[in-house]
Structures are given as structure tokens and as C-alpha cells.
């Protein structure tokens, strides 16, 4: 897996006006990382993990840049000439990488009401569109609008490319990336249901990457998924995941339940607590 | 209909510089996409060498980078490549072509580097 | 920089037989920046297959391109007398462009 930095930013119009503020996170490897809110920017760190590590230095200077490129989103949006009465969002995520032979990629998308009409390649400056004649045509309109943009500004889009991948290299350095696996701590619970049954619960948490197998397992069977609940993998704000699975069963049958689970190679089982 | 032509002298000394232009007529280079520049070794594989953009950026092969430079004449619709302090091995024949996957190519020239 | 890798070095098959050629990256590439050509003696490369899928204008359709991530495909469904030559691949994702080193396609 490369190490990634990927900045999303939206940007909305309603009856042909475009609003002010925008929205913007960052991810780093994945794992949420910074978040502006939409009036006021202001980076904020995603958690404890990524504030022990970073000054605000980072946050000052993030905040600097986002403000800006959400300025210039904004501009863009205004530049789009088919907009229709309702709300309209212009979306644009830039991605830069760092894989393990020390080669890069760095490439930005533009979304208009979540439909992807516009890529770039930063590194080589190609563009790439879909082949619909709706994309086509706001393709063509906002690349004239940034090609003329950019002549005026003289910034081009490796700068971009080299931007982020500066800013990656940076937070590689700073150790602000986890390692790449943090297995999981399993907590099992069990709650009165109704009479002669009991809900037991298993918790997995603080784990990376999110991909985890959780389940309910009687005499060493799994259980059928339609005899267990799960919650949905979320991001607990330190950048890690957290996750649920619960199933009901007979009091006094509780020691032949155990919750499995498989992360990143490695399996445990956890009985119920009597 | 989009073309391509390389022009240059076909035989350079060693330790000289290495000089073409290629011309493109059907489309302007300030529209879009790189303009490169390829070469092929005698019975060898291609290389790439590097490009200049539609934008005006220059992208080159750090295999060569402290020698070469891209340059371009838009009024001329040109672009031009310089290779300083040649020696035996940039014996080849020399592309332009356009793209990043490169749909047009000029038929190439022949450069020879001996004294 | 990123190494392509074509195999066979050279295929030897008779005309109306399949041809497949394989083209592997020491890194993931993506497969809109991945590209064939054919090249025959004495002329400039031809663009053959973009965006790994796509056949280049004036193509026939037994070429057919396919792949992802490292791993990259040419095929020629039925060898004619004129599809023997020197096929390249080539990626565009990250600077330096590169090359395969080629497969030389000859008659058996």
C-alpha cells in the first residue's frame, strides 16, 4: 500500500448563486486528518493522534492553503454555465502517493453533483474525461476556465503536484502515520433481553486498517447472519476503527458462544463473561 | 490532419550539441496535450525523453536531465530539443510525437554522433 | 522510475493463430495511463492500444487490450501476415515515461 494525502473539497450553489464557505478533509493513509467546517475554516486535527504530533504550525498553514483552494473551487463553480434552479455542488479531491519504489502519483477529480467529469494527472498535466457528452461539455468549460486562470496566476499544476507531495513527505517524517497494522482490543458484553434470553455484545476497537471480520460462533460454528446484528465500522477520532456485533441467546448456554475475529491476518476468539 | 516533422543535422561530433526541431502543422501546440521527444538506439528499444507541455512545462528523463533542454517557438508551432556533450551512445534515430499515449509521431531522423 | 517488463522476448506463431503478450510493472500503474504501439522496420511506432482497452484509430478488431495494477495484456485474436512486428508497451503514469523493452512477434 502507497502512503497517500488526499484533500477533498465541496464547494455549493443554490439558484445559480454560489455560496460562501465550503467544506474540506484530508485524509492521510486512509484515516481521517483534518476537517474544515463551512463558514469559518479552520483545520482541525482528527483526533488526539494526529494533534500530539503536529504544532500548529501545520494547522496555520493548512488552514492557509485550503482557504485558498476553496476560493478558487468557488470560482470555478461560478464559471459553470449550465447550472439549474436548486442546489449544485462542485467537488474536488487531489490525491498525491508515495509507493514503496519512491515513485509518485498525483491526480485531482472534479465531481459536479457527485458525478465525476473532469481528472487530472498532475505529474504529466494530462487530462482525462468520461465519455458522456453532459461531462464532456463541463469538462471543456472549466478546463478553459483553469487553463485561462492559470495563465493569469502563472501557477501550474505541478506545483500542485509538488505541494502535496511535500506536504505527505512532511507528515512521513513527522511520524504522524501510524505503522501500518494496530490490532484490535475485543471487548464481549452481555445485557438482559427478556426473560430466559440474553443480548451478548462484542466490541472491537482501536484498530487499523478497518477491514475486520467480527462474529458470533456457537460450539465453534458461525452463527447464520440473520441471528446477528452488526454495527457499522466507523472511525473511533484517533485514527482507528471501531465496530460492533451482537446476537441473542439462552441464559445458561452462554459457554458455548465465543466472538471470533480476523484482522489483518491474525484471529482470536473471546468467550462471554459468566 | 495532424503531422509531424523532425529537422536537424544528422551528424554531430563528440562532446558537441545536439540539435532539432520539430514542426507540427494541424494543431496548435499550445491547445493541449505534451510534445515529446523518443529515440531508438540502432536495434535497441525506445526512450523517452522528455516533453514540453501545452502549458509551457518541461518534463525530462532524469536519465538525461543534466544534458537536455525542450524548448518551444509557439508562434512557429515548433518545439525543440537540445542534447549537450554527445557521445557514441546517443547514436539513434530521433522521434517527436505527441500525446501522453503518443497517437502522432513523426517519421524520425537519423543522428549520428562521430568524429 | 517505473520498469516495464515484456514477455515473451520474442513469440514465434503462424499466421491465424492467437497471440498473447504480456507487459508487467514493478509498480501499479493506472490502467488509463497504460498504452501499446506496434513498430515495423524502418518506420515510426504506431499507436496501437490506449488507455490499455482502447483501439487507436484505424485499428482492426482482433487487437484487444486488457489489465490493471501491474499486470498488462495484448492480444491478437487471429495473426495476420501484416500484425508481425515489434509490439511495446508503455506507461504514463509517473515521469519517466517508460517502455517495455519490446516482444519481436515473427512468423513460424
Known amino acids: 500500500e502507497p502512503h497517500s494525502l488526499r484533500y477533498n473539497l465541496t464547494v455549493l450553489s443554490w439558484d445559480g448563486s454560489v455560496q460562501s464557505g465550503f467544506l474540506a478533509e484530508v485524509h492521510l493513509d486512509g484515516q481521517p486528518f483534518l476537517r474544515c467546517d463551512r463558514q469559518k475554516c479552520r483545520a482541525k486535527p482528527q483526533g488526539q493522534w494526529a494533534e500530539d504530533v503536529l504544532g500548529n504550525k501545520t494547522w496555520d498553514r493548512e488552514t492557509r492553503d485550503l482557504t485558498g483552494n476553496g476560493k478558487d473551487l468557488r470560482m470555478t463553480l461560478a464559471h459553470i454555465k449550465d447550472q439549474k434552479e436548486g442546489l449544485h455542488s462542485l467537488q474536488e479531491i487531489r490525491v498525491c502517493e508515495i509507493h514503496e519504489d519512491n515513485s509518485t502519483r498525483s491526480s485531482q477529480h472534479f465531481y459536479y453533483d457527485g458525478e465525476l467529469f473532469l481528472s487530472q494527472n498532475l505529474e504529466t498535466e494530462e487530462w482525462t474525461m468520461p465519455q458522456s457528452s453532459r461531462a464532456q461539455t463541463l469538462a471543456m468549460n472549466v478546463r478553459n476556465f483553469l487553463k485561462e486562470d492559470a495563465m493569469k496566476t502563472k501557477t501550474h499544476y505541478h506545483a500542485m503536484h509538488a505541494d502535496c507531495l511535500q506536504e505527505l513527505r512532511r507528515y512521513l517524517k513527522s511520524g504522524v502515520v501510524l505503522r501500518r497494522t494496530v490490532p484490535p482490543m475485543v471487548n464481549v458484553t452481555r445485557s438482559e433481553a427478556s426473560e430466559g434470553n440474553i443480548t451478548v455484545t462484542c466490541r472491537a476497537s482501536g484498530f487499523y486498517p478497518w477491514n475486520i471480520t467480527l462474529s458470533w460462533r456457537q460450539d465453534g460454528v458461525s452463527l447464520s447472519h440473520d441471528t446477528q446484528q452488526w454495527g457499522d465500522v466507523l472511525p473511533d477520532g484517533n485514527g482507528t476503527y471501531q465496530t460492533w456485533v451482537a446476537t441473542r441467546i439462552c441464559q445458561g448456554e452462554e459457554q458455548r458462544f465465543t466472538c471470533y475475529m480476523e484482522h489483518s491476518g491474525n484471529h482470536s476468539t473471546h468467550p462471554v463473561p459468566s | 490532419q495532424v503531422q509531424l516533422q523532425e529537422s536537424g543535422p544528422g551528424l554531430v561530433k563528440p562532446s558537441e550539441t545536439l540539435s532539432l526541431t520539430c514542426t507540427v502543422s494541424?494543431?496548435?501546440?499550445?491547445?493541449?496535450?505534451?510534445w515529446n521527444w523518443i529515440r531508438q538506439p540502432p536495434g535497441k528499444g525506445l526512450e523517452w525523453m522528455g516533453f514540453?507541455?501545452?502549458?509551457?512545462?518541461?518534463k525530462y528523463n532524469p536519465s538525461l536531465k543534466s544534458r537536455i533542454t525542450i524548448s518551444r517557438d509557439t508562434s512557429e508551432n515548433q518545439f525543440s530539443l537540445k542534447l549537450s556533450s554527445v557521445t557514441a551512445a546517443d547514436t539513434a534515430v530521433y522521434y517527436c510525437?505527441?500525446?501522453?499515449?503518443?497517437?502522432?509521431w513523426g517519421q524520425g531522423t537519423t543522428v549520428t554522433v562521430s568524429s | 522510475e517505473i520498469v516495464l517488463t515484456q514477455s515473451p522476448a520474442t513469440l514465434s506463431l503462424s499466421p491465424g493463430e492467437r497471440a498473447t503478450l504480456s507487459c508487467s510493472a514493478t509498480?501499479?500503474?493506472?490502467?488509463?495511463?497504460f498504452h501499446w504501439y506496434q513498430q515495423k522496420p524502418g518506420q515510426a511506432p504506431r499507436l496501437l492500444i490506449y488507455?490499455?482497452?482502447n483501439l487507436a484509430s484505424g485499428i482492426p478488431a482482433r487487437f484487444s487490450g486488457s489489465g490493471s495494477g501491474t499486470s498488462y495484456t495484448l492480444t491478437i485474436s487471429s495473426l495476420e501476415p501484416e500484425d508481425f512486428a515489434v509490439y511495446y508497451c508503455?506507461?504514463?503514469?509517473?515521469?519517466?515515461?517508460?517502455f517495455g523493452q519490446g516482444t519481436k512477434l515473427e512468423i513460424k
Open positions: 514540453v507541455s501545452y502549458s509551457g512545462t518541461t
Open positions: 488507455r490499455t482497452s
Open positions: 494541424g494543431y496548435s501546440i499550445t491547445s493541449d496535450y505534451a
Open positions: 509498480s501499479s500503474i493506472s490502467s488509463i495511463y
Open positions: 510525437a505527441r500525446g501522453y499515449g503518443f497517437d502522432y
Open positions: 508503455q506507461q504514463g503514469t509517473t515521469i519517466p515515461f517508460t
